[in-house]
Amino acid sequence: HSDPARRGELSVCDSISEWVTAADKKTAVDMSGGTVTVLEKVPVSKGQLKQYFYETKCNPMGYTKEGCRGIDKRHWNSQCRTTQSYVRALTMDSKKRIGWRFIRIDTSCVCTLTIKRGR
Amino acid sequence: HSDPARRGELSVCDSISEWVTAADKKTAVDMSGGTVTVLEKVPVSKGQLKQYFYETKCNPMGYTKEGCRGIDKRHWNSQCRTTQSYVRALTMDSKKRIGWRFIRIDTSCVCTLTIKRGR
């Protein structure tokens, strides 16, 4: 996809993206709300693949850690917040059952607003 | 996860999320920029699973289709933009080779800014 910075654009919230291995993650939350162990490797025909996840979260070192960029501060309070999505992963639950489950991973950093009161 | 709406918060950009099947997607762009066919089913031990993707994009019917919510319009132009991420999927390339590849899917709707010139 095209890059906003290339077009002289700025993001309202600064984010950071990285490839995360199952070894880094270790556990995750599945769709039933339970904690599952993320297996390091997935069997495929002719071998195994390391489980990787492309994760995006709000940049804790970024300019926008105190609030979102470009907001009308007279009317709004703002906060950059990491949002999540579901991806399928090979996991093991608390009963040691291995299987493909949808787990939550961080996928974005978005800006949320609350209206300023008592003005 | 905690919910923004519950805390009286608004998103700077309105988004819509849904489960998308491989049959709906048909094709996708992989990490090398090539177009691949997304296979409908994934073989698992003793059976098959339908390939599903959890996708989030900017809501074309939302309030923010004309620009982001809460922006300081004196200084900034704004636009809600769908961003993408990578997830692993079972795919077939143009040479009919089947394999697990990272493909791009829509995962978020974020606000991008451009500074207003000539003020």
Partner: antibody, heavy 115, light 108 residues
Framework: DVQLVESGGGVVRPGESLRLSCAAS????????MTWVRQPPGKGLELVSH???????YYADSVKGRATISRDNSIDTFYLQMNSLRAEDTAVYYC?????????WGLGTLVTVSS | EIVLTQSPGTLSVSPGERVILSCRAS??????LAWYQQKPGQAPRLLIY???TRATGIPARFSGSGSGTDFTLTINRLEPEDFAVYYC??????????FGGGTKVEIK
Amino acid sequence: DVQLVESGGGVVRPGESLRLSCAASGFDFSSYGMTWVRQPPGKGLELVSHIVDLGGGYYADSVKGRATISRDNSIDTFYLQMNSLRAEDTAVYYCARGNTFFDYWGLGTLVTVSS
Amino acid sequence: EIVLTQSPGTLSVSPGERVILSCRASQNVRSDLAWYQQKPGQAPRLLIYDSSTRATGIPARFSGSGSGTDFTLTINRLEPEDFAVYYCQQYYDWPPLAFGGGTKVEIK
């Protein structure tokens, strides 16, 4: 106590629209997936649509393109907007709590599509 | 898509008897299977999840077993209030979640 209360059912003509609501209480609504399941008269259960805790919708093939599921976590309510209704949509519509299996159900609301 | 087949369609039994209901999946669903009870004019009620775990408040006479493709719901010493329709549901291949066609347990 967990409670789910459906509303919005009634008699409609083919081609018309209807919005079903499910008001939840007694639990942290925003942390749960919610589901609409329907049951035609004298028949079995059919999953119609599902919305996960993060807000994404799933639709059965029988309603895809005609239905929209949504939730408003600020008032602990979720909805099913059904358009272009058909005679085969006639059923009791139940809302239920859960992403994978359903531990609490509403009493149901009857939707009748008839000319 | 996974298909769940319940058998028999109807079962005529007397109170106090032991009842065994069957649910067969068209492919492996691990133990990701639930059972529901539905009485006439009422909503379904969750009995069993994860193939064998009883839901909150469900009497011990209800038990579930099985994994893979073959599952059973057993009701020991049938009580008068147990006459109902019983449905199984898989949640391994999600989405879509599939229900079985149901088994009606009626008074002999």
